[in-house]
């Protein structure tokens, strides 16, 4: 029942933490513009990976997309690598551990398919998580270089007047996102696999002792609990005890979504 | 069509206050910040704050800090604006005006003459 | 705050000529998040509520006369008519709304001769 608990929550945290990463990476505010000394702004600027933003205090919105592959900085091709494929592979996740839930029955598959699949999805949950801690991370990385380099240059101009401003970008609601959802993933990974290990138990393997008894000739071999380390496919003298009545509780999550040139 | 009618012009004595009008149609009233702007005879023009009556909120210009308060009415679509402790220096034409995309005042009141004198 | 420099304070032309007044601010009105600059230019007829004619300084409000032709970036920004008319009379005044307090610049009267 434990196992079946710690894969269930597992799956539940990792389908909101890739739910999460989907709505991070979609998200048009991965940076938004420092209003250090001036909270109220005539005009806001926004940027995300795909499209950057400018609000007016008018409520007027545009947005504009990178229409260009080759003109953008490595970086933010990087942290779009980085995001996709921690998506492609929680998803991959996603459907490889609906199949390797205990509660849910296909056909005859056998508990150590089960704790292979399991393990497998743990795997790629963990590594999901941290492909998108690790783009936002450098995301954020890029922005804090980028904020004091602009900082630096900030006041220019002839005999000290001011004639330009530079915008000054700080961390988006996205980054926070993509970091919470990058760790909820990780976590609800760890928890697959550790559930793996309860769904697979060690196994011990009893040689088959022969007793000769006068007159008879009866061979006794004890039907002791053989249970496979979760890679073998042995399934003879197998024996499993749940500790009592299934429950199988169908938790479901719905992801809440929220909003370089 | 958009239109923005403001009340009629007032007199008054220094250091009494006033509160001016400005009813909205053809819009969505709650939706649009409304602007207030002073014109002294003769002179140029001078923002005097905003309000969003939506929610409430309000940027001011430092300068009419204290002597200006914007208020709106959803119900009734009318923007307010309260002139306090009035001097010949706030003898003036008073207009309101919506605020549309590009951050520009679209439409504008006739204006509200307000005379300060005793 | 942004301070709005406009020159000359006035100027006299005769119908069908062509005329160009200017604007500076004390910063930038460039946003570089949509290189839009936020300048905006208004007419005011005598006894009237000023109109709207220009925004984002070059974007022409809709039922706007072609002749009026807003131009310039970052600092300095000009309007111009190509061929006044007699119903150009009027006082022109631009507008920071880039940032907070909104200003106006000081004006140009255009007479007609």
């Known amino acids: 029942m434990a196992v079946t608990a710690c894969q269930g929550l597992g799956f539940v945290v990792s389908l909101i933490g890739i739910a999460g990463i989907i709505a991070a990476t979609c998200m048009d505010q991965w940076s938004t513009q420092d209003l250090y000394n001036n909270p109220v702004t005539a005009v806001f600027n926004y940027q995300g990976l795909w499209r950057s933003c400018v609000r007016e205090s008018s409520g007027f919105t545009e947005c504009r997309g990178y229409f260009t592959l080759l003109g953008l900085p490595a970086m933010l091709q990087a942290v779009r690598a980085l995001m996709i494929v921690g998506i492609v592979l929680g998803a991959i996740g996603l459907l490889v551990s609906i199949f390797a839930l205990k509660c849910i029955r296909i056909g005859s598959m056998e508990d150590s398919a089960k704790a292979n699949m399991t393990l497998t999805s743990g795997i790629m949950f963990i590594v999901s998580g941290l492909c998108a801690i690790a783009g936002v991370s450098v995301f954020a990385n890029m922005l804090v270089t980028n904020f004091w380099m602009s900082t630096a240059n900030m006041y220019t101009g002839m005999g000290g007047m001011v004639q330009t401003v530079q915008t000054r970008y700080t961390f988006g609601a996205a980054l926070f996102v993509g970091w919470v959802a990058g760790g909820l993933t990780l976590i609800g990974g760890v928890m697959m696999c550790i559930a793996c290990r309860g769904l697979a138990p060690e196994e011990t393997n009893y040689k088959a002792v022969s007793y000769h008894a006068s007159g008879h000739s009866v061979a006794y071999k004890p039907g002791g609990f053989k249970a496979s380390t979760g890679f073998g496919s042995n399934t003879k003298n197998k024996k499993i005890y749940d500790g009592g009545a299934r429950t199988e509780d169908e938790v479901q999550s719905y992801p809440s979504k929220h909003d370089y040139v | 069509q958009v239109q923005l009618q403001q009340s009629g012009a007032e007199l008054v004595k220094p250091g009494a206050s006033v509160k001016i009008s400005c009813k909205a149609s053809?819009?969505?009233?709650?939706?649009?910040?409304m602007n207030w702007v002073k014109q002294r005879p003769g002179k140029g023009l001078e923002w005097i704050g905003q309000?969003?009556?939506?929610?409430?909120?309000?940027n001011y210009n430092g300068g009419f800090k204290g002597k200006a308060t914007l208020t709106a009415d959803k119900s009734s679509s009318t923007a307010y604006m309260h002139l306090n402790s009035l001097t010949s220096e706030d003898s003036a034409v008073y207009f309101c005006?919506?605020?549309?995309?590009?951050?520009?005042?679209?439409?504008w009141g006739q204006g509200t003459s307000v005379t300060v004198s005793s | 705050d942004i301070v709005m420099t406009q020159s000359p304070s006035s100027l006299t032309v005769t119908a069908g000529e062509k005329v160009t007044m200017s604007c500076k601010s004390s910063q930038s009105l460039l946003n570089s998040g949509n290189q839009k600059n936020y300048l905006t230019w208004y007419q005011q007829k005598p006894g009237q509520p000023p109109k709207l004619l220009i925004y984002?300084?070059?974007t022409r409000e809709s039922g706007v006369p072609d002749r009026f032709t807003g131009s310039g970036s970052g600092t300095d920004f000009t309007l111009t008519i190509s061929s006044v008319q007699a119903e150009d009379l009027a006082v022109y005044y631009c507008?920071?709304?880039?940032?907070?307090?909104?200003?106006f610049g000081s004006g140009t009267k255009l007479e007609i001769k």
């Open positions: 053809g819009y969505a009233f709650s939706n649009y910040w």
């Open positions: 507008q920071n709304v880039y940032s907070y307090p909104i200003t």
């Open positions: 309000i969003y009556p939506g929610n409430g909120n309000t």
């Open positions: 984002w300084a070059s």
């Open positions: 005006a919506r605020w549309g995309t590009g951050n520009t005042m679209d439409y």
